[in-house]
């Protein structure tokens, strides 16, 4: 059974030319996090794997860093960038967790943090 | 279009070393990581480990730590695998293979180069 | 280590047969597979990533489908090209592992 839950940065929101963090966080189960994928929409961006480390997709190269822990850096951000964004987490025994994040990329200089919430 | 062109085949004596290189083209160097798979006569596919030349790092099959040694020169646009302390039991054909776009898989790969070991 | 073993071994077929090649993985690996081609004398070559998805320019002829532990290669209609030894290979660990291989031939 699935007990866990996937806490995120929710919706969040950063200026035109800077960087954020997207960060989840997998809690309420001992299950063993084998890889988490992060996808923006259906486009890969990352994968962490636990025997592989990190792979970045080669069009994202450029302005995507690893880290920091299982979350990403997104740098260099456009208008385009803003959308939803996915933490896909495969663990053992339990399976798939998936959690949502929505950025919004603003041209002025009045970016804030929305409030952390969870999806079970 | 994308090609990698791997160095010429070797002999080599027992406890010698040698150096395989692979040359690519037609996208960015940096952007794919570089795979290293072996291929013994007659025998299936074994991968060695693969390097990322945006960063330089490196992941080996915990079989070949020691035994293969991976680099690159990105401004030759090319990867190279050292294999030491060669053995008979070593003889294969070495090929080099562009990452994917999506993971660990190897979307392209070099004409493969084949190092014999005998005394 | 994840251990890939292939069925069968090998095949013997005809032009315009159906063919189909099984890959089932030791543990888990959900849809991390991809599958590869090879001739004799020659490099392997990506048919299949990801389980199902085709690279550009492979024919439409080839399919993969699968996930968790058991996958398939589908040729629909086998062309004389298409004799060659077929491997699968996980991508979802370390090591990567292949298959021990599929030689397709003519009957």
């Known amino acids: 059974m699935m007990t866990g839950t996937i806490e995120t940065t929710g919706n969040i929101s950063a200026e035109k030319g800077g960087s954020i963090i997207l960060q989840c966080h997998l809690s309420s189960t001992t299950a063993q996090v084998t890889q988490v994928n992060w996808e923006q929409q259906d486009q890969l961006l990352a994968i962490c794997n636990a025997d592989l480390g990190w792979h970045i997709s080669p069009s994202f190269k450029d302005r995507v860093a690893p880290g920091p822990g299982l979350g990403l850096t997104l740098q260099s951000l456009t208008v385009n960038d803003t959308g939803e964004y996915f933490c896909i987490y495969h663990t053992y025994p339990d399976g798939t967790y998936t959690g949502r994040i929505f950025l919004e990329v603003l041209e002025s200089s009045v970016a804030e943090h929305g409030a952390r919430f969870q999806i079970p | 279009q994308v090609q990698l062109v791997q160095s010429g085949a070797e002999v080599k004596k027992p406890g010698a070393s040698v150096k395989v290189s692979c040359k690519a083209s037609?996208?960015?160097?940096?952007?794919?990581?570089m795979y290293w798979v072996r291929q013994a006569p007659g025998q299936g596919l074994e991968w060695i480990a693969f390097?990322?030349?945006?960063?330089?790092?490196?992941t080996y099959n915990q079989r070949f730590r020691g035994k293969a040694t991976l680099t690159v020169d990105t401004s030759i646009s090319t990867a190279y695998m050292e294999l030491s302390r060669l053995r008979s039991d070593d003889t294969a054909v070495y090929y080099c293979?562009?990452?994917?776009?999506?993971?660990?898989?190897?979307?392209?790969w070099g004409q493969g180069t084949l190092v014999t070991v005998s005394s | 280590d994840i251990q890939m073993t292939q069925s069968p071994s090998s095949l013997s077929a005809s032009v315009g047969d159906r063919v189909t090649i099984t890959c089932r993985a030791s543990?888990?690996?959900?849809?991390?597979l991809s599958w590869y081609q090879q001739k004799p004398g020659k490099a392997p070559k990506l048919l299949i990533y990801?389980?199902?998805s085709l690279p550009s320019g492979v024919p439409s002829r080839f399919s993969g489908s699968g996930s968790g532990t058991d996958f398939t290669l589908t040729i629909s209609s086998l062309q004389p090209e298409d004799f060659a030894t077929y491997y699968c290979?996980?991508?979802?660990?370390?090591?990567?592992?292949f298959g021990q291989g599929t030689k397709v031939e003519i009957k």
């Open positions: 543990q888990s690996i959900y849809s991390y």
């Open positions: 990801n389980a199902k």
């Open positions: 293979a562009r990452g994917g776009d999506y993971g660990w898989y190897l979307g392209v």
């Open positions: 290979q996980h991508h979802y660990g370390n090591p990567l592992t």
């Open positions: 390097i990322d030349p945006y960063n330089g790092g490196s």
């Open positions: 037609g996208y960015a160097f940096s952007r794919y990581s």
